[in-house]
């Protein structure tokens, strides 16, 4: 057994439409068939769960219908997209990976991706 390492980018800038994407990669110590990925947001020492999805290796990960996250998986890599972000959502987004099955269970936690969100300036009225 060895500890599971999770890697994610340090910084991501959300698009003007409030969409941020980043890759969460984990070094799997075992042959997991069921994986759970959770995105946590840490801001001012408060932690909240943004979204979570469990998937079978080889299959797509599916978030709940009302989730602000979407994602795709490829091997030990998960491509995560968070939508609907506003400036107030700026914070550290941490990728948590759990190898649920078969035993043993493994937990890996990334160092977090600082997502910066800048609300677009409203378009000024134009005089012609």
């Amino acid at each position: 057994c060895k500890a599971m390492h999770v890697a994610q980018p340090a910084v991501v800038l959300a698009s003007s439409r409030g969409i941020a994407s980043f890759v969460c990669e984990y070094a799997s110590p075992g042959k997991a068939t069921e994986v759970r990925v959770t995105v946590l947001r840490q801001a001012d020492s408060q932690v909240t769960e943004v979204c979570a999805a469990t998937y079978m290796m080889g299959n797509e990960l599916t978030f709940l219908d009302d989730s602000i996250c979407t994602g795709t998986s490829s091997g030990n890599q998960v491509n995560l997209t968070i939508q609907g972000l506003r400036a107030m959502d700026t914070g550290l987004y941490i990728c948590k990976v759990e190898l649920m099955y078969p035993p043993p269970y493994y937990l890996g936690i990334g160092n977090g991706t600082q997502i910066y969100v800048i609300d677009p300036e409203p378009c000024p009225d134009s005089d012609f």
Epitope: C1, A3, E34, V47, T54, L107
Partner: antibody, heavy 118, light 108 residues
Framework: QVQLVESGGGVVQPGSSLRLSCAAS????????MHWVRQAPGKGLEWVAV????????HYADSVKGRFTTSRDNSKNTLHLQMNSLRAEDTAVYFC???????????WGQGTLVTVSS | EIVLTQSPGTLSLSPGERATLSCRAS???????LAWYQQKPGQAPRLLIY???SRATGIPDRFSGSGSGTDFTLTISRLEPEDFAVYYC?????????FGPGTKVDIK
């Protein structure tokens, strides 16, 4: 605020069964793994079992595998530990604990005492 | 399974003194998955430190954690009367999750 309250402990004979419960409140129960940890009189902490999120995955300590079963009812915010074929060495205070977002056991119940004696 | 060893078994100190508790793992543990708990007689354990060095909510800053790999340390900078208790380290990165045997900090 987060609260965990265990119940169901008592004195039983070797070979018998007992069912412990843990009532949870103050948080989104289904978003957390839930653990059972025990402590024999005057001894240290021993992890017993965990049940994850929707209840489909469970893991057990070797010392209780095949004898203990944990379950959860997310609609009632309740956790259970069914203990069968009890032995004298199962005598302990049993705690339920919440698996925090980062995996550590961030909240604990007050514990319930199980005594297995003839 | 990962075996955790704590030392010393008992630490006898006076209030105001510094306490240094050690936890050693039989194999490498992710620093994200190492916690310290405090337990007083007749009470449930209380989370102090998670992720090797992050203080849990409401824990005073005299408690600090450090370390990586197989060696971890809990430091109490100045012991207060309420700090005399048993301290356990725990790894929660791989099942079965394991606790150390504990270090008792008592009054000299």
């Amino acid at each position: 605020q987060v609260q965990l309250v265990e119940s169901g402990g008592g004195v039983v004979q070797p070979g018998s069964s007992l069912r412990l419960s843990c009532a949870a409140s103050g948080f989104t129960f289904s978003s957390h793994g839930m653990h059972w940890v025990r402590q024999a009189p005057g001894k240290g902490l021993e992890w017993v079992a965990v049940i994850w999120y929707d209840g489909s995955n469970k893991h057990y300590a070797d010392s209780v595998k095949g004898r203990f079963t944990t379950s959860r009812d997310n609609s009632k915010n309740t956790l259970h530990l069914q203990m069968n074929s009890l032995r004298a060495e199962d005598t302990a205070v049993y705690f339920c604990a919440r698996g925090g977002y980062f995996g550590c056991f961030d909240y604990w119940g007050q514990g319930t005492l199980v005594t297995v004696s003839s | 399974e990962i075996v955790l060893t704590q030392s010393p078994g008992t630490l006898s100190l006076s209030p105001g003194e510094r306490a240094t508790l050690s936890c050693r793992a039989s194999q490498s543990v992710s620093s994200s998955c190492l916690a310290w708990y405090q337990q007083k007689p007749g009470q449930a354990p209380r989370l102090l430190i998670y992720g090797a060095s992050s203080r849990a909510t409401g824990i005073p800053d005299r408690f600090s954690g450090s370390g990586s790999g197989t060696d971890f340390t809990l430091t109490i900078s100045r012991l207060e009367p309420e700090d005399f208790a048993v301290y356990y380290c725990q790894q929660y990165g791989i099942s079965p999750f394991t606790f150390g045997p504990g270090t008792k900090v008592d009054i000299k």
